[in-house]
């Protein structure tokens, strides 16, 4: 399958439009601070070069690898040293070390201004004036802020973004048509980015085996009628796709993802009965649809797992012959029977099974030793079930905002060293599990909740890795991918933490809070709550609630006052004094 020119091969496979979009995404994800115009110039140069290679694959430099071509192009940026500091040292390296170096410098929390949405008329004018530039700008802004965004999926988002403007800029009420669509794309985009970030962390921090185990479990739940061999093939192909995308090989990734979608649709009869509608769609929609497809119905009359994995006298023989294949079969069989379990729970069960076999297959009487292995699963299953039940009850009692606040307090007490913006962002997202999952029936709650929490806790892990401040976070993030959530759940109040000095400035607010959206105002209040807990980690729920109620009333009052700024100044001083008294500061 070797091609004389890799760049010509990908250009022909993907077409010019997708080729240019993917190169722009790749460059923006590597050089996150570079201006848009600089990236467009680089992309145009690469595209022109690719066209010469399509015309003549033997032309000069056309035989070079994509990493070499793209890396050389990135290293021509004049301001590399001033803008990126030590990342410029990557350019002194040879491939593949140079690409690895660029990957290591991807920043999950780049210092970029928040994206402010212009007025609808301004956006529509820009869209009509130059549609191509407008859409490229979208790709660029998302890619640089989300350096691990799944590139072929970003093409799908851009397609929907274009469709929204095409439709709504002609509508009678442009804003009513467009704004809900943009909100939906923004929220879905953030979720998609976070999900992909977990896949990349899984591959990069825990290796291919960890990712494959995750994929076996998830695909077996989704395609329970498919044979193990079929699931294994899909897992191998999916692992290749995600390895490529996480490694910055976006052209190969998009090409291979298209091939995988094609294969799945050509073989849907042996994979799942739920794929028919997906497979009638165009490529980008098709791939997205397959990735989100609902679980197929479980085959009727599946035999008990115990026969092959506990009662059989050949368990140790089968395990010894091909450990990973046997464990893969166990995971496949368990997962297809349990769409009601989270993937991480299934992986914990498989790990327990593996540990038991490792121990028992070396024992005098292996069968006697592993006979009760399924009994060890009971507490592992009950722990997330109970946790979800308790937290959904709390969510239903409090509502989303107050539930988020309860989690803010809980997590700040566990890991008070973590930066306030990170604690706010992560706890707000943890709190969204309530509205996302608690509405589901029992059978769907755990896969929804625990797998979502894995995605959110990974955000905490990647943000913390950039500036590590807490040994407890490092420990929970690095010891075991599947036990991250139980590890964080088990953390108690950090008794070693020295409370932060009280700083009145932290609790000084101004009239600008009144013009913020409800969400932004919540974030301000939640930021204050985290700071309160950092000052007084032993504060009771009741004390914190009293202070937060005072704070809400203070904002409400001053935002209704004639002289808002004076109100904030005078009432603010009293709020600080009242809070200090209430918390005994």
């Amino acid at each position: 399958d070797a091609h004389k020119s890799e760049v010509a091969h990908r250009f022909k496979d993907l077409g010019e439009e997708n080729f240019k979009a993917l190169v722009l995404i790749a460059f923006a994800q590597y050089l996150q601070q570079c201006p848009f115009e600089d990236h467009v110039k680089l992309v145009n140069e690469v595209t022109e070069f690719a066209k010469t290679c399509v015309a003549d694959e033997s032309a000069e430099n056309c035989d070079k690898s994509l990493h070499t071509l793209f890396g050389d192009k990135l290293c021509t940026v004049a301001t590399l040293r001033e803008t990126y500091g030590e990342m410029a040292d990557c350019c002194a390296k040879q491939e593949p070390e140079r690409n690895e170096c660029f990957l290591q410098h991807k920043d999950d929390n780049p210092n970029l201004p928040r994206l402010v949405r212009p007025e609808v008329d301004v956006m529509c004018t820009a869209f009509h004036d130059n549609e191509e530039t407008f859409l490229k700008k979208y790709l660029y802004e998302i890619a640089r802020r989300h350096p691990y965004f799944y590139a072929p999926e970003l093409l799908f988002f851009a397609k929907r973004y274009k469709a929204a403007f095409t439709e709504c800029c002609q509508a009678a009420d442009k804003a009513a048509c467009l704004l809900p669509k943009l909100d939906e794309l923004r929220d879905e985009g953030k979720a998609s980015s976070a999900k992909q970030r977990l896949k990349c962390a899984s591959l990069q921090k825990f290796g291919e085996r960890a990712f494959k185990a995750w994929a076996v479990a998830r695909l077996s739940q989704r395609f329970p009628k498919a044979e193990f061999a079929e699931v294994s093939k899909l897992v191998t192909d999916l692992t290749k796709v995600h390895t490529e995308c996480c490694h910055g090989d976006l052209l190969e990734c998009a090409d291979d993802r298209a091939d995988l979608a094609k294969y799945i649709c050509e073989n849907q009869d042996s994979i799942s009965s739920k794929l028919k509608e997906c497979c009638e769609k165009p490529l980008l929609e098709k791939s997205h649809c397959i990735a989100e497809v609902e679980n197929d119905e479980m085959p009727a009359d599946l035999p008990s797992l115990a026969a092959d994995f506990v009662e059989s006298k050949d368990v140790c023989k089968n395990y010894a012959e091909a450990k990973d294949v046997f464990l893969g079969m166990f995971l496949y069989e368990y997962a297809r029977r349990h769409p009601d379990y989270s993937v991480v729970l299934l992986l914990r069960l498989a790990k327990t099974y593996e540990t038991t076999l490792e121990k028992c297959c070396a024992a005098a009487d292996p069968h006697e030793c592993y006979a009760k292995v399924f009994d060890e699963f009971k507490p592992l299953v009950e722990e997330p079930q109970n946790l979800i039940k308790q937290n959904c009850e709390l969510f239903e009692q409090l509502g989303e905002y107050k539930f988020q606040n309860a989690l803010l307090v809980r997590y700040t007490k566990k890991v008070p060293q973590v930066s306030t913006p990170t604690l706010v962002e992560v706890s707000r997202n943890l709190g969204k599990v309530g509205s996302k999952c608690c509405k589901h029936p029992e059978a769907k709650r755990m896969p929804c909740a625990e797998d979502y929490l894995s995605v959110v806790l990974n955000q905490l892990c990647v943000l913390h890795e950039k500036t590590p401040v807490s040994d407890r976070v490092t420990k929970c993030c690095t010891e075991s991918l599947v036990n991250r959530r139980p590890c964080f759940s088990a953390l108690e109040v950090d008794e070693t933490y020295v409370p932060k000095e009280f700083n009145a400035e932290t609790f000084t607010f101004h009239a600008d809070i009144c013009t913020l959206s409800e969400k932004e105002r919540q974030i301000k209040k939640q930021t204050a709550l985290v700071e309160l807990v950092k000052h007084k980690p032993k504060a009771t729920k009741e004390q914190l609630k009293a202070v937060m109620d005072d704070f809400a009333a203070f904002v409400e009052k001053c935002c209704k006052a004639d002289d808002k700024e004076t109100c904030f100044a005078e009432e603010g001083k009293k709020l600080v004094a009242a809070s200090q008294a209430a918390l005994g500061l």
């Epitope: 005072d550 009333a553 409400e556 009052k557 209704k560 005078e570 009293k574 709020l575 004094a577 209430a582």
Partner: nanobody, 123 residues
Framework: QVQLVESGGGLVHPGGSLKLSCAVS????????MHWVRQAPGKGLEWVSG????????TYADSVKGRFTISRDNAKNSLYLQMNSLRAEDTALYYC????????????????WGQGTLVTVSS
Amino acid sequence: QVQLVESGGGLVHPGGSLKLSCAVSGFTFHHYAMHWVRQAPGKGLEWVSGISWNGNKITYADSVKGRFTISRDNAKNSLYLQMNSLRAEDTALYYCVRDSSLFIVGAPTFDHWGQGTLVTVSS
């Protein structure tokens, strides 16, 4: 405009009880701390009790501690003072007073007063 109207005063025997009420209008009641202040015949003003915007923080003058209870009902825009074990020295004109702040911290800042209701404790 801001209005504070007290009621519930009257003549009572020593050891007896009374409940004063204050109905407010013309402002957002839950945006303010509230107080009771009294003036005995021929004497100056004496602060009696204060309550924060939501009733979380309550303070009393030493002279009434354990006998008087301040409360508020934000839904009804009303302030109350339950007076038990009344003594002759509690005889006074009782004023319902708005604080300019939400909170009871430091010196109170009175900005609006009612007309007062008279309490007479006598045998």
